[in-house]
Amino acid sequence: AGHLEQPQISSTKTLSKTARLECVVSGITISATSVYWYRERPGEVIQFLVSISYDGTVRKESGIPSGKFEVDRIPETSTSTLTIHNVEKQDIATYYCALWEV
């Protein structure tokens, strides 16, 4: 079965800079899975942001600002990366990755 690890326990960024969050997949080939990213703001319910499927298709939640989030995966390191552009107060949250095994 697949296993996920987010090596960065926390990430501190200056306003307007770019943040990159990593999710390392083990126990399964990343190319055979879909990786989902969610965020949980303080005091709010968890919210789906973006996913990248086994065939590379990216799906974004409607209502999420365009250009704010980018998702990628690197088969060589079995890693999915969530990039957050122009970091703002509204982006302060705990970010989770999740796996869907095809």
Partner: antibody, heavy 126, light 109 residues
Framework: EVQLVESGGGLVKPGGSLRLSCAAS????????MNWVRQAPGKGLEWVSS????????FYADSVKGRFTISRDNAKNSLLLQMNSLRAEDTAVYHC???????????????????WGQGTMVTVSS | DIVMTQSPGTLSLSPGERATLSCRAS???????LAWYQQKPGQAPRLLIY???SRATGIPDRFSGSGSGTDFTLTISRLEPEDYAVYYC??????????FGRGTKLEIK
């Protein structure tokens, strides 16, 4: 001195347009979320719109959605509110207000409008 | 949308007395997103309390905030002459982001 100064108010006929401006000084404008809040004569406060520091997140009250547009120019320390299709019920003093910003303590994510302008009066009447 | 209900509408108290103002939300509000303001005639509002219980810069310690969930309270321990004003609670949420209560007018008895 931290300051917000609104301008652009005035008398306009129903269906008309106005553009409000808010000039910010005394702080790093690009680091703060900004808001417009209005107050009709003798009434309470009504939040109108907000815009995040890099303009990614923009929200409107249902009462103005589709008619008002908020924007900002971080290079000019300026907040704008374009108001179209104005109605009599839009008559109010319009304040711009700054959100608390990001602190480095445990309350870093708390919200609250900590700096307000004195407001500009908008009157919609035929 | 979350509706914020403030009570009482008007509160008449004498200087030196304790004032207790209530704010009730129509659904749960994280204390992170609850603020209180004071407004005097002809002036812009002033932030008193954010995060339900944290005093804003320069606010005297006779002002305190408490509460969680749907019930929040602003307390003024000993009323001073300059405290007579209208007080508003406000929540930050996701749809729409900000909503204010209708206010409590604190007047001299």
């Amino acid at each position: 001195e931290v300051q917000l100064v609104e301008s652009g108010g005035g008398l306009v006929k129903p269906g008309g347009s106005l553009r409000l401006s808010c000039a910010a000084s005394g702080f790093t404008f690009s680091h703060y979320d900004m808001n417009w809040v209005r107050q009709a004569p003798g009434k309470g406060l009504e939040w109108v719109s907000s815009i995040s520091s890099s303009s990614s997140y923009i929200f409107y009250a249902d009462s103005v959605k589709g008619r008002f547009t908020i924007s900002r120019d971080n290079a000019k320390n300026s907040l704008l509110l374009q108001m179209n299709s104005l109605r009599a019920e839009d008559t109010a003093v319009y304040h711009c207000a700054r959100d608390r910003g990001v602190g480095d303590t445990s309350d870093y994510y708390s919200f609250g409008l900590d700096v307000w302008g004195q407001g500009t009066m908008v009157t919609v009447s035929s | 949308d979350i509706v914020m209900t403030q009570s009482p509408g008007t509160l008449s108290l004498s200087p030196g007395e304790r004032a207790t103002l209530s704010c009730r939300a129509s659904q749960n509000v994280s204390s992170t997103y609850l603020a209180w303001y004071q407004q005097k005639p002809g002036q812009a509002p002033r932030l008193l309390i954010y995060g339900a219980c944290s005093r804003a810069t320069g606010i005297p310690d006779r002002f305190s905030g408490s509460g969680s969930g749907t019930d929040f309270t602003l307390t003024i321990s000993r009323l001073e002459p300059e405290d007579y004003a209208v007080y508003y609670c406000q929540q930050y949420g996701s749809s729409p982001p900000y909503t204010f209560g209708r206010g409590t007018k604190l007047e001299i008895k």
